[in-house]
């Protein structure tokens, strides 16, 4: 990527934090080894990273949980990557599903998802979980960035 | 990205390559169907990726894992991607977590690991696994690489 | 990456179709939120990628299936990204190995790989798994993509 | 136990060249980046060069630049410093040394090897 | 270069007193939650010793009665109480970023 003002490096990468909220959407901070490339990307409101130009992305995020089979519901653990753009429907770009563990009192699993998509300026990323409460927050288990291209 | 020799393309993708040794460090290789682009990035004593340049990195790993929950210690199977950098503390850069399996003799499971981060020149990054020896070698199935942004 | 004429952004991302086809290898489609960035990365046959320029690739496949312990082969669940180049052999890239769920009648798991390679022009890159009939093919659970560095 | 020792200084023209080697023990030589730095005459602590484990990444400061290579053998756990167009204002004591495991600071020293530049 | 001004350059302390030790970064030392700032005890004739790293972590062996702290530009380091064998050169250094460099040492004499 040129250097220059006119193409500079866009990209952030966020790590997970814990949350009181009841929310399916997880929450990030810009904290520990962290990255934000300048302010052409946000993180908003602790929950979404948000593009001001228009074009492809590589968008990812990582999520590990701790379940059990038992103690859960029937559905599977599912990570969702969703998209919300001005003007337009909300959409899910990717999705991961792992069915929950045996292993007591719970079993670690890790989910990565990653993939690239057009943004136009203002576009908003967030991830979602079933539950959230599952999802483990230890150094660098969890974390969600993106690289325009 | 442009191909001129001040913003020359710098990525790598290495090869895992069954060790003797107990370091809970993964060795890799250049073989294979392995990517070095240039010397701005080296495979430094057959574990760790250093690179000569500051910039942004997209950088990831995949293991492939064989193991049993009866034959292992209860501790999931976990792997880091690390960072040492001359002058800093070490970081866990990115971890990921997967409860070992049921399955007899062992049950195969893979992990992908992937972010962007900041680094320093004569930063080296590198894999770390819980139990090297459960590691799959397999053609494609345990792989380190980065790219620079 | 420059914009120019010179060197145009090359990406593509495509999602997962089901096929009644017995092949094992995956069938993809440029529906939904998909990507392709211009005609110098096609989407040949709805099953392989394929570039018209050399250069390096970040190439990757994001898979989830569905299959049980006991319904499934003693095996596990292998996706598989491959690449065919003009007179060259036909080589794996990654792979990535998940045994089989115990839960009924069937438990998710998501598979992502995702590596940087040298691609010549004409290479075409597909997707290969043990049993497409497990694959998930709900909204953003299974897709394929690539972008050139 | 860490162990560093330098040996090769001496009395040189300026002009001259010499070169410095530390013997490295008590730990995994490959596994550190290495350093050296230089005390003048005044007591001015300055950081001379870096070189990376598996020695492939090297660095210095502007005014050594093009006059010193840092270089290693992970095979005999020997990191050397070599000198060239040597000036007055090179006099010093030049130390190795290592940082501690994944922390910062230089906290092995060996204990220096006396490099005279004079006429 | 990030230069670093140590004051003062020299300092007398009596037995059992504190002695504080100042070091000023011409820019930011601090990266991902660290400050990338050491201190060091020089010794006529012996290398420096590493005392603290990264701005306030005390180095293994070394006594307690060295502390340390600062963030961003400004950092201090103190020794309380000042014992007889504290006689010596003190040196800050930043690992923050290539070129690593030095205070130009404060010598402490115990009065």
């Known amino acids: 990527m040129q250097k220059g003002d006119q193409n500079p490096q866009i990209a952030a990468h966020v790590i997970s934090e814990a949350s009181s909220k009841t929310t399916s959407v997880l929450q990030w901070a810009e904290k520990g080894y962290y990255t934000m490339s300048n302010n052409l990307v946000t993180l908003e409101n602790g929950k979404q990273l948000t593009v001001k130009r228009q074009g492809l992305y590589y968008i990812y995020a990582q999520v590990t949980f701790c379940s059990n089979r038992e103690a859960s519901s029937q559905a599977p653990f599912i990570a969702s990557l969703c998209l919300k753009s001005p003007g337009r429907f909300e959409r899910i770009l990717l999705r991961a599903a792992n069915t929950h563990s045996s292993a007591k009192p719970c079993g670690q699993q890790s989910i990565h998802l990653g993939g690239v998509f057009e943004l136009q300026p203002g576009a908003s990323v967030f991830v979602n979980v079933t539950d959230p409460s599952q999802v483990s927050h230890g150094t660098g288990f969890t974390s969600f960035g993106l690289l325009k291209l | 990205m442009q191909k001129g020799d001040q913003n020359p393309q710098i990525a790598a993708h290495v090869i895992s390559e069954a060790s003797s040794k107990t370091t809970s460090v993964l060795q890799w290789a250049e073989k294979g169907y392995y990517t070095m682009s240039n010397n701005l990035v080296t495979l430094e004593n057959g574990k760790q990726l250093t690179v000569k340049r500051q910039g942004l990195y997209y950088i990831y790993a995949q293991v492939t894992f064989c193991s049993n929950r009866e034959a292992s210690s209860q501790a999931p199977f976990i792997a880091s991607l690390c960072l040492k950098s001359p002058g800093r503390f070490e970081r866990i850069l990115l971890r990921a977590a997967n409860t070992h399996s049921s399955a007899k003799p062992c049950g195969q499971q893979s992990i992908h690991l992937g972010g962007v981060f900041e680094l320093q020149p004569g930063a080296s990054v590198f894999v770390n696994v819980t139990d090297p020896s459960q590691v799959s070698h397999g053609t494609g199935f345990t792989s380190f690489g980065l790219l620079k942004l | 990456m420059q914009k120019g004429d010179q060197n145009p952004q090359i990406a593509a991302h495509v999602i997962s179709e089901a096929s009644s086809k017995t092949t094992s290898v995956l069938q993809w489609a440029e529906k939904g939120y998909y990507t392709m960035s211009n005609n110098l990365v096609t989407l040949e046959n709805g099953k392989q990628l394929t570039v018209k320029r050399q250069g390096l690739y970040y190439i990757y496949a994001q898979v989830t299936f569905c299959s049980n312990r006991e319904a499934s082969s003693q095996a596990p669940f292998i996706a598989s990204l491959c690449l065919k180049s003009p007179g060259r052999f036909e080589r794996i890239l990654l792979r990535a190995a998940n045994t089989h769920s115990s839960a009924k009648p069937c438990g998710q798991q998501s598979i992502h790989l995702g590596g940087v390679f040298e691609l010549q022009p004409g290479a075409s890159v597909f997707v290969n798994v043990t049993d497409p009939s497990q694959v998930s093919h709900g909204t953003g659970f299974t897709s394929f993509g690539l972008l050139k560095l | 136990e860490v162990q560093l020792v330098e040996s090769g200084g001496g009395s040189v023209k300026p002009g001259g060249s010499l070169k410095l080697s530390c013997a490295a023990s008590?730990?995994?030589?490959?596994?550190?980046?290495m350093y050296w730095v230089r005390q003048t005459p005044e007591k001015r602590l300055e950081w001379v060069a870096i070189i990376s484990g598996g020695g492939s990444y090297t660095s210095y400061p502007d005014s050594m630049k093009g006059r010193f290579t840092i270089s290693r053998d992970n095979a005999k756990n020997i990191l050397h410093l070599q000198m060239s167009s040597l000036k007055s204002e090179d006099t010093a004591m030049y130390y190795c040394?290592?940082?501690?495991?994944?922390?910062?600071?230089?906290?092995?020293w060996g204990q220096g090897t006396l490099v005279t530049v004079s006429a | 270069d990030i230069e670093l001004t140590q004051s003062p350059t020299s300092l007398a302390v009596s037995l059992g007193q504190r002695a504080t030790i100042s070091c000023k970064a011409s820019q930011s030392v601090d990266y991902a939650g660290d400050s990338y700032m050491n201190w060091y005890q020089q010794k006529p004739g012996q290398p420096p010793k590493l005392l603290i790293y990264a701005a306030s972590n005390l180095e293994s062996g070394i006594p307690a009665r060295f502390s340390a702290s600062g963030s961003g530009t400004d950092f201090t380091l103190n020794i309380h109480p000042v014992e007889e064998e504290d006689a010596a050169t003190y040196y800050c250094?930043?690992?923050?970023?290539?070129?690593?460099?030095f205070g130009g040492g404060t010598k402490l004499e115990i009065k």
């Open positions: 250094q930043q690992s923050y970023e290539d070129p690593w460099t």
């Open positions: 040394t290592r940082e501690s495991n994944g922390k910062p600071g230089f906290a092995y």
């Open positions: 008590g730990f995994t030589f490959s596994d550190h980046y």
